[in-house]
């Protein structure tokens, strides 16, 4: 990896080894100010592989609310507006980092956790395996 | 929000107010063990709105490497394998949390940051604005 020259103004830390505990400021800096506010707002409905968004809430996690996409159909919507099984709707998944309260119910102590979330759906050509 | 009963075994913290600094264990717990290994592995190529993945590296960020999707075409791939501009390939975007080293170059001090990443692409019906 890339070695980072240490800033002499860094806070002290006792343990330099992994697994390590670090200080994190939860005052979130949002880098998304210049993004198009419409973004993917209505793509879930206009897509040929439309999806619904389900609210997943967990007070022991930060962020506590995550939205999960579920594809509406197994097939994709064709030009006639019908579900066509010659194509497949599939979820696009991404691993994201969240903070898990550890020990449980502690407001100021967390552990990083990787979770897999479905962000939306896309329409793919199926892999066809014919019987010999 | 939901109030969480405080665990008496929690570490002490001086500042109980937001913005607050918390302790985070960077030994990542991976909750994705039972997921289908096939996942989105080749969807980027098989999709009617295919995309390329671009590596975004920033040593001041944790995770330092994030993969960004860029749609290959403005239109979508039709049944003949051609790009059809009656439909649009659009990126599915998601806000994710990352840790930003703060002050810069400090190995043990971070600030939460929200960034917008493109995870993949989906094919949507365009919104047609007719001239009056």
């Amino acid at each position: 990896g890339i070695t980072i020259p240490r800033n002499p103004g860094c806070p002290n830390s006792e343990d330099k080894n992994f697994p390590r505990t670090v200080m994190v400021n939860l005052n979130i800096h949002n880098r998304n100010t210049n993004t198009n506010p419409k973004r993917s707002s209505d793509y879930y409905n206009r897509s040929t592989s439309p999806w619904n968004l389900h609210r997943n809430e967990d007070p022991e996690r930060y962020p506590s609310v995550i939205w999960e996409a579920k594809c509406r159909h197994l097939g994709c919507i064709n030009a006639d507006g019908n579900v066509d099984y010659h194509m497949n709707s599939v979820p696009i998944q991404q691993e994201i980092l969240v903070l898990r309260r550890e020990p449980p119910h502690c407001p100021n102590s967390f552990r990083l956790e990787k979770i897999l979330v479905s962000v939306g759906c896309t329409c793919v050509t199926p892999i066809v395996h014919h019987v010999a | 929000g939901i109030t969480i009963p405080r665990n008496p075994g929690c570490p002490n913290s001086e500042d109980k107010n937001f913005p607050r600094t918390v302790m985070v264990n960077l030994n990542i717990h991976n909750r994705n063990t039972n997921t289908n290994p096939k996942r989105s592995s080749d969807y980027y190529n098989r999709s009617t709105s295919p995309w390329n993945l671009h590596r975004n590296e920033d040593p001041e960020r944790y995770p330092s490497v994030i993969w960004e999707a860029k749609c290959r075409h403005l239109g979508c791939i039709n049944a003949d394998g051609n790009v059809d501009y009656h439909m649009n390939s659009v990126p599915i975007q998601q806000e994710i949390l990352v840790l930003r080293r703060e002050p810069p170059h400090c190995p043990n001090s971070f600030r939460l940051e929200k960034i917008l990443v493109s995870v993949g692409c989906t094919c949507v019906t365009p919104i047609v604005h007719h001239v009056a």
């Epitope: 579920k70 159909h73 507006g81 019908n82 579900v83 099984y85 497949n88 892999i127 | -």
Partner: antibody, heavy 120, light 111 residues
């Protein structure tokens, strides 16, 4: 308890249009299910004809696509089947059925079926 | 269109004995999302079909545990561990990975 009930004429003349309605009780047709039409010719197996989903999207059997239309009336909690240009081969028991649509995609409730005979 | 082929077409079984029905599809039933949408239904004489098994091996609620499903890809099996009199009827496999289709049915009767 969910119930689905087919209704419509039991006799249709060749070349005419067969029309059936399914009335759903105990479940809104706009909740997360697909509403199917499946038929069974006398003494034969089952044939899927098509469905309309909770969101109003339809899907049809490719072999029947040009002749079949499925629609719904959410105010009456009903969905309907129209099959045009019928022949004697369309004589069958017609079932309406609810399909669990939340990553199961299997029919979980069937109507009792209605026999439609195509004859002049 | 996917062709579902069941065997045997007729299955005489002694009460209390096991029974097994095979279903083969002309194409793999694994969807691009990794799931397999293969289901089983029972149709008793003079009745509508009734749900049994969904997605290869999951029993619908209320279905006795003597019914079990297995298989993958293109080859699937429905097993009844001990046949009872009420199990008489026609059993259909069905797939919804592609445009939905049904097998031609297997008639189970008591010897």
């Amino acid at each position: 308890q969910v119930q689905v009930q087919e209704s419509g004429p039991g006799l249709v003349k060749p070349s005419e249009t067969l029309s059936l309605t399914c009335t759903v009780s105990g479940n809104s047709i706009t909740s997360y299910y697909a509403w199917n039409w499946i038929r069974q010719p006398p003494g034969k197996g089952l044939e899927w004809m098509g469905y309309i989903t909770y969101s109003g999207t339809t899907s049809y059997n490719p072999s029947l696509k040009s002749r079949v239309t499925i629609s719904r009336d959410t105010s009456k909690n009903q969905f309907s089947l129209k099959l045009s240009s019928v022949t004697a081969a369309d004589t069958a028991v017609y079932y309406c059925a609810r399909e669990e649509y939340d990553d199961i995609y299997a029919v979980d409730y069937w109507g009792q079926g209605t026999l439609v005979t195509v004859s002049s | 269109i996917i062709v579902m082929t069941q065997s045997p077409l007729s299955l005489p079984v002694t009460l209390g004995q096991p029974a097994s029905i095979s279903c083969r599809s002309s194409q793999s039933l694994v969807h691009s999302n990794g799931n397999t949408y293969l289901h089983w239904y029972q149709q008793r004489p003079g009745q509508s079909p009734r749900r049994l098994i969904y997605k290869v091996y999951n029993r619908f609620s209320g279905v006795p545990d003597r019914f079990s499903g297995s298989g993958s890809g293109t080859d699937f099996t429905l097993k009844i561990s001990r046949v009872e009199a009420e199990d008489v009827g026609v059993y259909y496999c069905s797939q919804s990975t592609h445009f939905p289709t049904f097998g031609q049915g297997t008639r189970l009767e008591i010897k």
